[in-house]
Interface confidence: low
Amino acid sequence: DWVVAPISVPENGKGPFPQRLNQLKSNKDRDTKIFYSITGPGADSPPEGVFAVEKETGWLLLNKPLDREEIAKYELFGHAVSENGASVEDPMNISIIVTDQNDHKPKFTQDTFRGSVLEGVLPGTSVMQVTATDEDDAIYTYNGVVAYSIHSQEPKDPHDLMFTIHRSTGTISVISSGLDREKVPEYTLTIQATDMDGDGSTTTAVAVVEILDANDNAPMF
């Protein structure tokens, strides 16, 4: 039973530190006094001192808040030795998994996206794709899952719903007929990316859609 199940620790913990996580215990302590130690990145190698162990009790200690976006998993080794320094157990693998908090906002890859579409196209025509990233976890949680939306369109002509955006892919498409370069040569969309699949933090960017001439007006002489 010289085994420890993977330990989950939320990032950005408020403490107080040091915080007891789990207890290493060798059943050889019935026969002799045991001293415990840990090695590995996060203990005795960079980043040193994140984790420590109470030498006599075996309590594994966390000394400071963790950042999942910096290190998502620590692999340490636990050691048990007798008073005379002889190893009484094989080194034990200790996995510490840092669980995600929604501590990052989405970020658009550009402040301004530019695209173009031919005037008079049918609804459903794709115009461009925008992208936002979020450093938080998007596999086990929704913290880093981004949902896209259009907040506003200017000008609002012929009306304010000329475009739509796919909430998952960020693809902007024409949703209404009536694009006419002679009337409106360019639309400015304020787009939003919201994490937690639409229920979290929001960031904003701009998508500029140029309406291209379809040569529907004969030149006048």
């Epitope: 907040h151 000008p155 002509d157 009337k183 040569p185 360019e186 929001t202």
Partner: antibody
């Protein structure tokens, strides 16, 4: 650099029309990348955006709901200026009125302002 | 309409002090926020746009932060010319201003 110069009367009688003009130098009222705004400031209402015009191959305007039924903002391309008309004024409309330029549609704030005109509504 | 609430409404400070003014929006506005400085008898002057971008020509002692609903304007070391009234303004949905924060000499 862009400058805005305001002109217009400082005293207007109740129920009459308030008229102000904002002359633009260093830019064009027909710029495809600017919006031209009117904003007012009073002790009771603070800073209040009233409306704007902008040109994108044709003229567009947007007005604040609080004044929408009474306001008109017009461009004058020949004089490179734009004007504010506010009808049926009451003493509540007493304020310092500013014109201001917004980059694009105003997404970067109002960087250029006129000097302000104190308009008093009183008989 | 989106309401903008500033705090405090006034504060007294000395030259060299670090001054912080906060602004809260009635709904999330992402980073679509500007800060202005106004001196008596003058038009407002743009200091910060997009919540944290310093307007050209504005001293670096001014900085802005925040996103969503809560925003902060910080003056790292107050100078004599900084005594004025400061306004926040949102531009996500039309344009609305905070009620102002007057920074006075202690």
């Amino acid at each position: 650099q862009v400058q805005l110069q305001q002109s217009g009367p400082g005293l207007v009688k109740p129920s009459q029309t308030l008229s102000l003009t904002c002359a633009i130098s260093g830019d064009s009222v027909s710029s495809q990348s600017a919006a031209w705004n009117w904003i007012r400031q009073s002790p009771s209402r603070g800073l209040e955006w009233l409306g704007r015009i902008y040109y994108r191959s044709k003229w567009y305007n947007d007005y604040a709901l609080s004044v929408k039924s009474r306001i008109t903002i017009n461009p004058d391309t020949s004089k490179n200026q734009f004007s504010l008309q506010l009808n049926s004024v009451t003493p509540e409309d007493t304020a310092v009125y500013y014109c201001a330029r917004g980059e694009g549609y105003g997404r970067e704030g109002f960087a250029i302002w006129g000097q302000g005109t104190l308009v008093t509504v009183s008989s | 309409d989106i309401q903008m609430t500033q705090s405090p409404s006034s504060l007294s400070a000395s030259v060299g002090d670090r001054v912080t003014i906060t602004c809260r929006a009635s709904q999330t506005i992402s980073n679509t926020l500007a800060w202005y400085q106004q001196k008596p008898g003058k038009a407002p002057k743009l200091l910060i746009y997009a919540a944290s971008n310093l307007q050209s020509g504005v001293p670096s002692r001014f900085s802005g932060s925040g996103s969503g609903t809560d925003f902060t304007l910080t003056i790292s070391s107050l100078q004599p010319e900084d005594f004025a009234t400061y306004y926040c303004q949102q531009y996500l949905s039309w344009f609305t201003f905070g009620q102002g924060t007057k920074v006075e000499i202690k």
